[in-house]
């Protein structure tokens, strides 16, 4: 571990009440194959323990989707994640919208400091599928 | 190699016959920039020989595509990469339908071990094609 | 740095002129959140400077784009990023059309040999966006 | 402990106007949506829609636009239901409610109120 | 919109019956169906929520399981104050929608 390898994979336990957009992760070996080895959830949300450059990933898939579903929603569906807390380094990560898809996809490299909590939020009116194959949320730390 | 940086980045050879959903896929410097280093490939799918956290991701893009032909199948075209031997580790890691796209592409943190191999199923009546840059398939080791 | 960790996340900074697809990138701490550690920038190109397999991940947002927007042009708004010199090396590592959707997002390993310049051809009318949520354009050394 | 407390029972003529209101305690009114639900005498559960407590935003489902006005007055930590113009169909109990944890489920329900719409 | 239908619409059964009830979506509701019990002149009370997970200081005598577009809800032993009508719910999108309600009393 000293080697500095933190690492996680969430799966979705919830989604917050209509005014709060954050989706709720959870994980552990007991729910599937999610994980957390250095990370560590703090009220559902994944808080970073170690400084360094990471690999952020997400895929979000919606329950009820169609192309028509996520089209004729006057406010788009969008998935951002970003750093909430704390607010100091507040910060919006990787920002997609679903327009006519039903699932959205990304990675992106980020600098992450000790205490940085990210949050997830999905704005919209549907709600995202728990399958763990179509909803997952990982982080991988790649170099200090 | 002791180091377990198990990495592999294969190209499409071809699609199995109309009751196979798997994608047969082929790697090595040969064939262009596909390699396979720790990993193989068996029958076209790939097998892992290395426990540990890999970073699985894929992209597929349909061959004769536009919005509407994937829009208008009964149906929808699907891809999911999952664990298919052996039986007793058979799972889902990973799923994408089309929808209105003509590429899928995703990656997810999961473990694997040696043995396990990785069939990835794509369901529907459309092709996927064979170009190098529009559909590809990799694993990497990243920690134990 | 010996340890060969080379790795950047860059912004875009431009595109270019109407006959030059490329887009042009920028990174640095004083930008925000983009860096360059090993590889470097010419004239917004991104060149390695370490040989390896590496990581390349790209997402790219449309700037004013709805589902219609994307669907209704003649020709399809495409994003292909690969080697452009030394043209003895000239590939194309990664294709994606956007068809009915405003976000192509991806990723795959590929061996890269020092002195490669990767280009990132953004082919169609519409623009990206400059949001550094929204487009980024990132590599990381994996192996050697 | 969280409370939603309705106003009382309502009898009104057709083409009046009443106003139900829900007053929150036992939180912070702003962090929570309010939730409208219809019952007709004897028949099931209707949505009718919700109100954003922070931004103002009321979503109304189909049925219930026009007539049917959700407002706040966050400093008293109320929400309203409006409806003008009253047609006899009109006569249901109203619930106000509200989520805890999990979107779109309502641990908290006002205790209702009734209103009849008779000539 | 999302058509819930439950049954059925009322059931008479003894103290200590096992009950079941029934709903059924128009569509896959992924889970997200939640389960309330009403009685006379009373607000609804949260029983179940997510299919199958017991809202806090609800007796486990209930329960609820299904998937897709198929639902149950369980009572194991029935008791005199579990008379009540009792809604299935689809909290996955707006417009939210319950069903018609299945109305249970006591042989």
């Known amino acids: 571990e000293s080697l500095g390898w933190d690492i996680a994979e969430l799966q979705l336990n919830h989604t917050g009440p209509q005014q709060d957009p954050r989706l709720y992760w959870q994980g552990g070996p007991a729910l599937g194959r999610s994980f957390l080895r250095g990370p560590e959830l703090d009220k559902g949300q994944l808080r970073i323990r170690r400084d360094g450059i990471y690999m952020v990933h997400i895929q979000v898939t919606l329950a009820i989707c169609s192309s028509t579903s996520t089209s004729r929603h006057h406010h788009p569906t969008t998935l951002a994640v970003g750093i909430c807390s704390p607010a100091s380094r507040s910060i919006s990560l990787l920002r997609l919208s679903f327009h006519q898809g039903c699932t959205i996809a990304s990675q992106r490299l980020t600098p992450l400091a000790r205490g940085d909590t990210l949050c997830t939020n999905l704005t919209g009116t549907l709600l995202p599928s728990r399958n763990t194959d179509e909803t997952f949320f990982g982080v991988q730390w790649v170099r200090p | 190699e002791s180091l377990g940086w198990d990495i592999a980045e294969l190209q499409l050879n071809h699609t199995g016959p109309q009751q196979d959903p798997r994608l047969y896929w082929q790697g090595g410097p040969a064939l262009g920039r596909s390699f396979l280093r720790g990993p193989e490939l068996d029958k076209g799918q790939l097998r892992i020989r290395r426990d540990g956290i890999y970073m699985v991701h894929i992209q597929v893009t349909l061959a004769i595509c536009s919005s509407t032909s994937t829009s208008r199948h009964h149906h929808p075209t699907t891809l999911a990469v999952g664990i298919c031997s052996p039986a007793s580790r058979s799972i889902s890691l990973l799923r994408l339908s089309f929808h209105q796209g003509c590429t899928i592409a995703s990656q997810r943190l999961t473990p694997l071990a040696r043995g396990d191999t990785l069939c990835t199923n794509l369901t529907g009546t459309l092709l996927p094609s064979r170009n190098t840059d529009e559909t590809f398939f990799g694993v990497q080791w990243v920690r134990p | 740095e010996s340890l060969g960790w080379d790795i950047a996340e860059l912004q875009l900074n431009h595109t270019g002129p109407q006959q030059d697809p490329r887009l042009y990138w920028q990174g640095g701490p004083a930008l925000g959140r983009s860096f360059l550690r090993g590889p470097e920038l010419d004239k917004g190109q991104l060149r390695i400077r370490r040989d390896g397999i590496y990581m390349v991940h790209i997402q790219v947002t449309l700037a004013i784009c709805s589902s219609t927007s994307t669907s209704r042009h003649h020709h399809p708004t495409t994003l292909a990023v690969g080697i452009c010199s030394p043209a003895s090396r000239s590939i194309s590592l990664l294709r994606l059309s956007f068809h009915q959707g405003c976000t192509i997002a991806s990723q795959r390993l590929t061996p890269l040999a020092r002195g490669d310049t990767l280009c990132t051809n953004l082919t169609g009318t519409l623009l990206p966006s400059r949001n550094t949520d929204e487009t980024f354009f990132g590599v990381q050394w994996v192996r050697p | 402990q969280v409370q939603l407390v309705q106003s009382g029972s309502e009898l009104k003529k057709p083409g009046a106007s009443v106003k139900v209101s829900c007053k929150a305690s036992g939180y912070t009114f702003t962090n929570y949506g309010m939730n409208w639900v219809r019952q007709a005498p004897g028949q099931g559960l209707e949505w009718m829609g919700w109100?954003?407590?922070?931004?103002?935003?009321?979503t109304y489902a189909d049925g219930f636009t026009g007539r049917f006005v959700f407002s706040l007055d966050t400093s008293a930590s109320t929400a309203y239901l409006q409806i003008s113009s009253l047609k006899a169909e009109d006569t249901a109990v109203y619930f106000c409610?509200?989520?805890?944890?999990?979107?779109?489920?309502?641990?908290?329900w006002g205790q209702g109120t009734l209103v009849t719409v008779s000539s | 919109d999302i058509q819930m239908t439950q049954s059925p619409s009322s059931l008479s059964a003894s103290v200590g019956d096992r009950v079941t009830i029934t709903c059924q979506a128009s569509?896959?509701?992924?889970?997200?169906l939640n389960w309330y019990q009403q009685k006379p002149g009373k607000a609804p009370k949260l029983l179940i929520y997510d299919t199958s997970r017991l809202h806090a200081g609800v007796p486990s005598r209930f329960s609820g399981s299904g998937s897709g577009t198929d639902y149950t809800f369980t009572i194991s032993s029935l008791q005199p104050e579990d008379i009540a009508t009792y809604f299935c719910?689809?909290?996955?999108?707006?417009?939210?929608?319950f069903g018609q309600g299945t109305k249970l009393e006591i042989k």
């Open positions: 719910q689809q909290g996955v999108t707006l417009p939210l929608t």
């Open positions: 569509q896959d509701i992924s889970n997200y």
């Open positions: 409610a509200r989520e805890e944890d999990y979107r779109y489920v309502f641990n908290y």
């Open positions: 109100i954003n407590t922070y931004t103002g935003e009321p």
